[in-house]
Interface confidence: medium
C-alpha cells in the first residue's frame, strides 16, 4: 500500500507514535517519506547483505528475520515480511523498539539526512488528526 501523507499521519497517531520518545508525529511522517515514499512494500538491499523492509525501512541484520541475513539478531522478533503489510502495526511496534535503543531516530539515515533540524511539522500541516 502507498499511503497518502495525511492518511499515514493519522495511522501513526493511532498507533501512538506522536511524541513517542519525544519525537513529534512530523518526524515519523518525514522519515517514512524519505525512507520508502510512503510505500509499505518497499524493500532495499544493502551492501552488507542485509535488506531494509517496509514503510520505515527496518533492517534485517538487527531488527527482523528474513531467513537469509548472516548473523541476524531479529530484535523485534518478527519475520521481515510482516513489515510489508498494509497494516503498519508491526512496523510501528518495531520502530518503537528501535527508537528506544539509544540513538533515537538517528537510526534512520534518511531522517538524519532529510528531516533532522528541518520544519517537520510541515509533514502534518493541513491534516485532520
Amino acid at each position: 500500500k502507498v499511503f497518502g501523507r495525511c492518511e499515514l499521519a493519522a495511522a501513526m497517531k493511532r498507533h501512538g507514535l506522536d511524541n513517542y520518545r519525544g519525537y513529534s508525529l512530523g518526524n515519523w511522517v518525514c522519515a517514512a517519506k524519505f525512507e520508502s515514499n510512503f510505500n509499505t512494500q518497499a524493500t532495499n538491499r544493502n551492501t552488507d547483505g542485509s535488506t531494509d523492509y517496509g514503510i520505515l525501512q527496518i533492517n534485517s541484520r538487527w531488527w527482523c528475520n528474513d531467513g537469509r541475513t548472516p548473523g541476524s539478531r531479529n530484535l523485534c522478533n518478527i519475520p521481515c515480511s510482516a513489515l510489508l503489510s498494509s497494516d503498519i502495526t508491526a512496523s510501528v511496534n518495531c520502530a518503537k523498539k528501535i527508537v528506544s535503543d539509544g540513538n533515537g531516530m538517528n537510526a534512520w539515515v534518511a531522517w538524519r539526512n532529510r528531516c533532522k533540524g528541518t520544519d517537520v511539522q510541515a509533514w502534518i500541516r493541513g491534516c485532520r488528526l
Partner: antibody
Framework: QVQLQESGAEVMKPGASVKISCKAT????????IEWVKQRPGHGLEWIGE????????YYNEKFKGKATFTADTSSNTAYMQLSSLTSEDSAVYYC?????????WGQGTTLTVS | DIELTQSPATLSVTPGDSVSLSCRAS??????LHWYQQKPHESPRLLIK???QSMSGIPSRFSGSGSGTDFTLSINSVETEDFGMYFC?????????FGGGTKLEIK
Amino acid sequence: QVQLQESGAEVMKPGASVKISCKATGYTFTTYWIEWVKQRPGHGLEWIGEILPGSGSTYYNEKFKGKATFTADTSSNTAYMQLSSLTSEDSAVYYCARGDGNYYYWGQGTTLTVS
Amino acid sequence: DIELTQSPATLSVTPGDSVSLSCRASQSISNNLHWYQQKPHESPRLLIKYTSQSMSGIPSRFSGSGSGTDFTLSINSVETEDFGMYFCQQSNSWPRTFGGGTKLEIK
C-alpha cells in the same frame, strides 16, 4: 516438510514465451524469498533473480532483465517465472529455490528446450 | 559482480583418497560462502553453509574452511557416492554468483 515442486518440461519455439511454476509447501510462503537459477551444460549455475511473495518485491540479475519476469500467487503458494522472446540460449534447466542466503531447498528443475 | 573461481576443474581420485577443492573470490566475501554437491539429473544439495557449517545429514567427512577470498572444501577419505560436481556460491552481495564447478571423478 519444505518442498518446492516445479512444472514439467517444456519444448518451445524461438520467439515464444513460457511460464514456469514453483509450488511451495511446508512453510510460510510469504515470508521467504524465492530465487530462480539457470543451469546450462558447460555454463554452471546462474542466479536469475528473486521475488518475495508476500509483497511482490523483485530483484533481477542485470543479465536477465527483460528476459525473466517473476510473479507469485499467495493463494496457491506458487511462484512463477516467465521467460520471453525465447532463443536457443534459453535452453536450460531452471530451478527455484528458497532464498536463505544459501539454498537448502530446491525444486526438482524444469527443463526448457527451445527448438 | 563477484567472480568465484573453482579449481581444479576436474579432480580424478581413488576411493579412500582425501581431497581439497578450492574456491577463490574476486573480492572479500567474509564467510558468506556455501558449497553444493550435484549428481547428474539431480538438483544441487547444500553441503556446507557459511564456509564451515555442516548441514544435518551430511557425512562428517565433508568440511569447509577459509575466509575473505580463499575457501576450501575438504573430503576426508572419498567414497564412491561422493563423485559428481561441486559448486561454491557467495551470498555476500547481489547478484548471487556461483563458481564454475569442480568435477570429482573416479580415477
